[in-house]
């Protein structure tokens, strides 16, 4: 399977909410011995590999923001911790999963990564991720609402497997 990032760039005004999205592509095994661990983190554009470094989002680590479920089940973070930080991650039945960030500030600008780990029988793991940029703007040049820029087909199916 692969992870697609429908949008590679989100440009938002300060104070706005934004939902960053990734999508699981390809065949997804729905067997009872297969589960999915999905999460989000910030990173930097490394020289070797994007999304290699895992930094917190608003002080919450990728562990704090995880979703864990079987197949194409729906899930969302019910953590009070995440919601207190204006964050919520969610997943639907169609392979889409997202993180919503409320009341954006300039400090939220940066590279965001979604991570999916497919776990088979608890000892085989297949890891893929996607990356997207968030730019939060202020002042007269800032858009009135978030503007999203679609990924090229090559970018949107970027895959890194463990």
């Amino acid at each position: 399977f692969k992870v697609a990032t429908p949008y590679s760039l989100y440009v938002c005004p300060e104070g706005q909410n934004v939902t960053l999205t990734c999508r699981l592509l390809g065949p997804v095994d729905k067997g009872h011995d297969v589960t999915f661990y999905k999460t989000w983190y910030r990173s930097s554009r490394g020289e070797v590999q994007t999304c290699s470094e895992r930094r917190p989002i608003r002080n919450l680590t990728f562990q704090d923001l995880h979703l864990h479920h079987g197949g194409h089940q729906a899930a969302n973070t019910s953590h009070d911790l995440a919601q207190r930080h204006g964050l919520e991650s969610a997943s639907d039945h169609h392979g889409n999963f997202s993180i919503t960030m409320r009341n954006l500030t300039l400090l939220d600008s940066g590279l965001y990564c979604c991570l999916v780990v497919e776990i088979r029988h608890h000892h085989s793991e297949h890891r893929v991720h996607g990356a997207m940029e968030l730019q939060v703007q202020t002042g007269k040049d800032a858009p009135s609402n978030c503007v999203v820029y679609p990924s090229s087909s090559q970018d949107s199916e970027n895959i890194t497997a463990a």
């Epitope: 661990y37 070797v48 562990q63 864990h68 953590h79 776990i119 029988h121 608890h122 000892h123 463990a162």
Partner: antibody, heavy 118, light 106 residues
Framework: EVQLQQSGPELVKPGASMKISCKAS????????MNWVKQSHVKNLEWIGL????????SYNQKFKGKATLTVDKSSSTAYMELLSLTSEDSAVYYC???????????WGQGTSVTVSS | QIVLTQSPAIMSASPGEKVTMTCSAS?????MYWYQQKPGSSPRLLIY???NLASGVPLRFSGSGSGTSYSLTISRMEAEDAATYYC?????????FGSGTKLEIK
């Protein structure tokens, strides 16, 4: 604060069985696997196996199948490892450690020393 | 199973000296992880995904490598770095550790 609190040292007789506990606090227990690691003077660090509190699924190092049994109690956020038919070769320090999927064992218990002697 | 061979088994370094230790895998692995252990303490995660520092790890530590060859480097040795260092792989079941490199201070 993330903590993994293991049960105290044990002195047991050959042939006996025993259970070590690892109480987790400060994090979402079901979002991680709980791993168990053996450290002896002979073999350094050996991965015994893991259990997923999310669904109770386990995975064992073949070497420890029949020797170790892993269980969890979600209600108390506690992982257990039972060691069976103990021999002197099982004398070691045993650690529990949490691991997020696609990551590493980032927090470890303080270790439980097990001595098998008659 | 994948065997991880660490070298040297024992080494010593003076304060301020650069230290490099290696971990060789019997088969290719995707990522390497490094742990530090001091006597009487539990292992501590140092490096994840080959080259990334775990939370709270000093910047003098770095990791690199790919395939079957990995290394851990301390740019300037400090007294508190005296410990045993273990590499570990999650790529193939069963998950294995190296035999360790004991680093002593001169």
């Amino acid at each position: 604060e993330v903590q993994l609190q293991q049960s105290g040292p044990e002195l047991v007789k050959p042939g006996a069985s025993m259970k070590i506990s690892c109480k987790a606090s400060g994090f979402s227990f079901t979002g991680y696997t709980m791993n168990w690691v053996k450290q002896s003077h002979v073999k350094n660090l050996e991965w015994i196996g893991l259990i997923s509190p999310y669904d109770g699924g386990t995975s064992y190092n073949q070497k420890f199948k029949g020797k170790a049994t892993l269980t969890v109690d979600k209600s108390s956020s506690t992982a257990y490892m039972e060691l069976l038919s103990l021999t002197s070769e099982d004398s070691a320090v045993y650690y529990c450690a949490r691991r997020a999927y696609g990551y590493a064992m980032d927090y470890w218990g303080q270790g439980t020393s097990v001595t098998v002697s008659s | 199973q994948i065997v991880l061979t660490q070298s040297p088994a024992i080494m010593s370094a003076s304060p301020g000296e650069k230290v490099t230790m290696t971990c060789s895998a019997s088969s290719s692995v995707s990522y390497m992880y490094w742990y530090q252990q001091k006597p009487g303490s539990s292992p501590r995660l140092l490096i994840y995904d080959t080259s990334n520092l775990a939370s709270g790890v000093p910047l003098r530590f770095s990791g690199s490598g790919s395939g079957t060859s990995y290394s851990l480097t301390i740019s300037r040795m400090e007294a508190e770095d005296a410990a045993t260092y273990y590499c570990q792989q999650w790529s193939s079941y069963p998950f294995t550790f190296g035999s360790g490199t004991k680093l002593e201070i001169k």
